[in-house]
Interface confidence: low
């Protein structure tokens, strides 16, 4: 009996040591990544940013609200998380890509056009699970039908054509608050990733029945957080198999 108890304790201790080793390895990996990020940002210590500040800085769109709330739940959950998902399973990651300006876009018809997206190397065409363009439509005064058109910029053709349609949809808007609208752009994104030179940007139009453009493309001083953006979900296939 004594022997079996002793053996059990040794096994338990061995398992705990393994857990501790794994946890320490994970922690040191995370710390190393944090140090890299801070050095890239030229910061000595991590900024102390509250959830409220994050809410102000990020676009005010549904997927980001969900992410922030999710992060909050994770942070509040003090129970030890399982390492299993982390180490052995395929995970999906949501990457939010904000538009950047492109010289080419700025020259179209002498007016600024939105939007041009530069993609993280993490986004590979065969790993894209979902890609949605989110646009904010300003509030309307009367019930109206809105025609949303997403056009892809192309190199000017002989006939002068600069655009090709990606998506168009018709939606009814009622007075009140503006709305966030998502549009599936997975195929376009995959094509851009295969042929980066074809990525010259897009133009967003959301015209009501009177030709009034409701899409926020270049947020003004009072439109912080209403930029269009891409929500891309990528899958990260497992790098290790269970030993």
């Amino acid at each position: 009996n004594e022997n079996s108890e002793q053996k059990e304790n040794v096994e338990k201790e061995g398992l705990c040591n393994a857990c501790t080793w794994r946890q320490n390895t994970k922690s040191s990996r995370i710390e190393a990544i944090k140090i890299q990020i801070l050095s890239k940002l030229r910061l000595e210590t991590a900024p102390n940013i509250s959830k409220d500040v994050i809410r102000q800085l990020l676009p005010k769109a549904p997927p980001l609200r969900e992410l922030i709330d999710q992060y909050d739940v994770q942070r509040d959950d003090s129970s030890d998380g399982s390492l299993e998902d982390d180490d052995y399973h395929a995970t999906t990651e949501t990457i939010i890509t904000m538009p950047t300006e492109s010289d080419f876009l700025m020259q179209v018809d002498g007016k600024p056009k939105c939007c041009f997206f530069k993609f993280s190397s993490k986004i590979q065409y065969n790993k894209v699970v979902k890609a949605q363009l989110w646009i904010y439509l300003r509030p309307v005064e009367t019930p109206t039908t809105v025609f949303v058109q997403i056009l892809r910029l192309i190199k000017p053709m002989k006939d002068g054509t600069r655009y090709t349609g990606i998506r168009s949809l018709k939606l009814d808007m009622n007075p009140g608050t503006g709305i966030w609208q998502s549009i599936d752009v997975k195929t376009v994104l995959q094509n851009w990733l295969k042929q980066p030179e074809s990525n010259l940007g897009i133009e967003i139009k959301a015209l009501d029945e009177n030709g009034h453009d409701l899409a926020v493309t270049f947020p003004g001083p009072g439109e912080d957080g209403l930029n269009p953006f891409l929500e891309v979900k990528v899958t990260d296939t497992p790098k290790r198999s269970r030993r």
């Epitope: 600024p112 003004g220 001083p221 009072g222």
Partner: antibody
Framework: QVTLKESGPVLVKPTETLTLTCTVS????????ISWVRQAPGKGLEWVGI???????YYASWAKGRLTISKDTSKNQVVLTMTNMDPVDTATYYC?????????????WGQGTLVTVSS | DIVMTQSPATLSLSPGERATLSCTSS????????LSWFQQKPGQPPKLLIY???TLAYGVPSRFSGSGSGTDFTLTISSLQPEDAATYYC??????????FGQGTKVEIK
Amino acid sequence: QVTLKESGPVLVKPTETLTLTCTVSGIDLSHTDISWVRQAPGKGLEWVGIISYAGKKYYASWAKGRLTISKDTSKNQVVLTMTNMDPVDTATYYCARGVPAYSHGGDLWGQGTLVTVSS
Amino acid sequence: DIVMTQSPATLSLSPGERATLSCTSSQSVYHANWLSWFQQKPGQPPKLLIYWASTLAYGVPSRFSGSGSGTDFTLTISSLQPEDAATYYCAGGYGGGRYAFGQGTKVEIK
């Protein structure tokens, strides 16, 4: 129906503080920017300041240090406070939806309220 | 400080004539097109006519049109109507929460 209405004192003494209220209806202030613009009698329009839907404030350079714009979303009100009033501040003060010069801002205005600064 | 200059100060034309109002900014407006035109009649608040330099606001007659980019802008009324007698203002946005109005052009109908 969407409306904006300015209210406040019609007469203010020099060095006193002016407080004007813009009461909106049919507008959600958490989704709408409000601008203040003034117009001296017989003169042109002059931009005063903005409070964005997110509560960010932007003031005209001449008004910095004297001007505060705040809002109470639950009361549907935007408040302009200007200290150290001077006779040159005599003007009709307007509140407007959105930001004039940005997109279709300034598509809706209050009727304005004439404020006279005099002892 | 930003200065927006409108010319002429007064424009006196007959009904049916074409009116051309000019607005010049001392520095380029943001994104080359953050410019609006407003119409104001005595005792009334301003009315938005044109935004993004050339986009006609909701409910504005098509005889009004806007053009230009950067620092030079024009408001054109193709065929003046008696009800167009008013003062017209341009308003420019410069990013960073900076805005300015022109001093106005008064349009009189002979």
